[in-house]
Amino acid sequence: LNTTILTPNGNEDTTADFFLTTMPTDSLSVSTLPLPEVQCFVFNVEYMNCTWNSSSEPQPTNLTLHYWYKNSDNDKVQKCSHYLFSEEITSGCQLQKKEIHLYQTFVVQLQDPREPRRQATQMLKLQNLVIPWAPENLTLHKLSESQLELNWNNRFLNHCLEHLVQYRTDWDHSWTEQSVDYRHKFSLPSVDGQKRYTFRVRSRFNPLCGSAQHWSEWSHPIHWGSNTSKENPFLFALEA
C-alpha cells in the first residue's frame, strides 16, 4: 500500500510507505496499525528535530528512526544517534548540522522494532522546513520629525530571509503589518509624537534559499514615543 500524505509543510511530494502484514479476519494485526507521522524542522540550519506523537501508540513503544538522502552521495542508511524522549519513550530524533543537507531529498523511516514490517517512510525537502531564530537587536532611528526607521539583526544570512514587521500604538486594537524583503529595513513615514508605538519582527526562510511556510518566533518588542500619551479612548470605553 502506497499512500500519499498531504502535509502543511510545503512538501507536496511527501509519500509514506506502509508495509502491512496480512490482516487476520478475526483480529487486527499490530503491523496494520499506522505509525505516527514524523514532523521535521531545521532550526536556523544548526540542528534538526524530527518528532512524532508517541502517545498515539496503543501501548508504549520505542519506535526507531533511520534516515538517508535519496539519489545523493549521502544515500547510506543512518541510524538516529540522538533520540528525544517523552515519558521515557522515544518521540523524536535530533540531527546535528553536519547531518543536514538542504536541497537533497531527505528520507526518514519510522519503524516498530518489535514488528519490523511495521514501518513508514516519508520524503522531505528540508529547505522548506527551516525555521530561523527570532530577529534580535531591534533599533529605531528618527530619520525626520515624523519618520522612523526600524533595523534588526538575524543570526542567519540576510539574503535567505524575508520578514514581517508588526506595529501598533497604545490606541490600536490590532497590529498593522508589512512584509520586508532580505534588505531588512522598515520605515514608518508618519509617526504621531503623542502616541507610544510598539514594534516587533519575525523572519522566514523564503523565497531565495527555500520555500518555508513557518515563521520564526516574534522578536522582543521595541517601543517608541510618549509614555504619557493622550488618554486612550479605548480605556475610557472599558472603564465606562
Epitope: 539519489n71 538542504l102 536541497y103 537533497q104 544570512l157 539574503h159 535567505c160 523565497p207 531565495l208 534559499c209
Partner: nanobody, 117 residues
Framework: QVQLQESGGGSVQAGGSLRLSCAAS????????MTWARQAPGKGLEWVST????????AYAASVEGRFTISRDNAKSTLYLQLNSLKTEDTAMYYC??????????PGQGTQVTVSS
C-alpha cells in the same frame, strides 16, 4: 564530485561591462540556489549575489544592486553574472559557489575582473 568552472573575466575600463559564466557539474544543479562571491586583493570573500534554484528570486549586495544581474540556465547547468557600469572597486576575483553562500563548499578557481579608470 562537485566542479565549478568560472569564465568571462577580463580587464575593462570603468563604466564597461562583462558577463561571467560558471559551468557546474557533479551535482543536481537545478535543486540548489547558486551564489556569486568576490575577493578583492588583500580582502576577505564578499557575498555578491544569490539566485534561487528555479531562478525566480534573486538578491544582491547593496554595493552592486542595480548594476549586476544574476541569472541561470538549469538546462545547461550554468550560472551567469552580468556586470554593468563597472567601477574600480569591483576589481576582484569572482567565484561561483553551490548553495546560498555560507562559505561551504569552497568555490571554484575563480575568474579575475580588473577595472581601470
Amino acid at each position: 564530485q562537485v566542479q565549478l568552472q568560472e569564465s568571462g573575466g577580463g580587464s575593462v575600463q570603468a563604466g564597461g561591462s562583462l558577463r561571467l559564466s560558471c559551468a557546474a557539474s557533479g551535482f543536481s544543479f537545478s535543486s540548489y540556489p547558486m551564489t556569486w562571491a568576490r575577493q578583492a586583493p588583500g580582502k576577505g570573500l564578499e557575498w555578491v549575489s544569490t539566485i534561487a534554484s528555479d531562478g525566480g528570486s534573486t538578491a544582491y549586495a547593496a554595493s552592486v544592486e542595480g548594476r549586476f544581474t544574476i541569472s541561470r540556465d538549469n538546462a545547461k547547468s550554468t550560472l551567469y553574472l552580468q556586470l554593468n557600469s563597472l567601477k574600480t572597486e569591483d576589481t576582484a576575483m569572482y567565484y561561483c559557489t553551490k548553495g546560498y553562500g555560507d562559505g561551504t563548499p569552497a568555490p571554484g578557481q575563480g575568474t579575475q575582473v580588473t577595472v581601470s579608470s
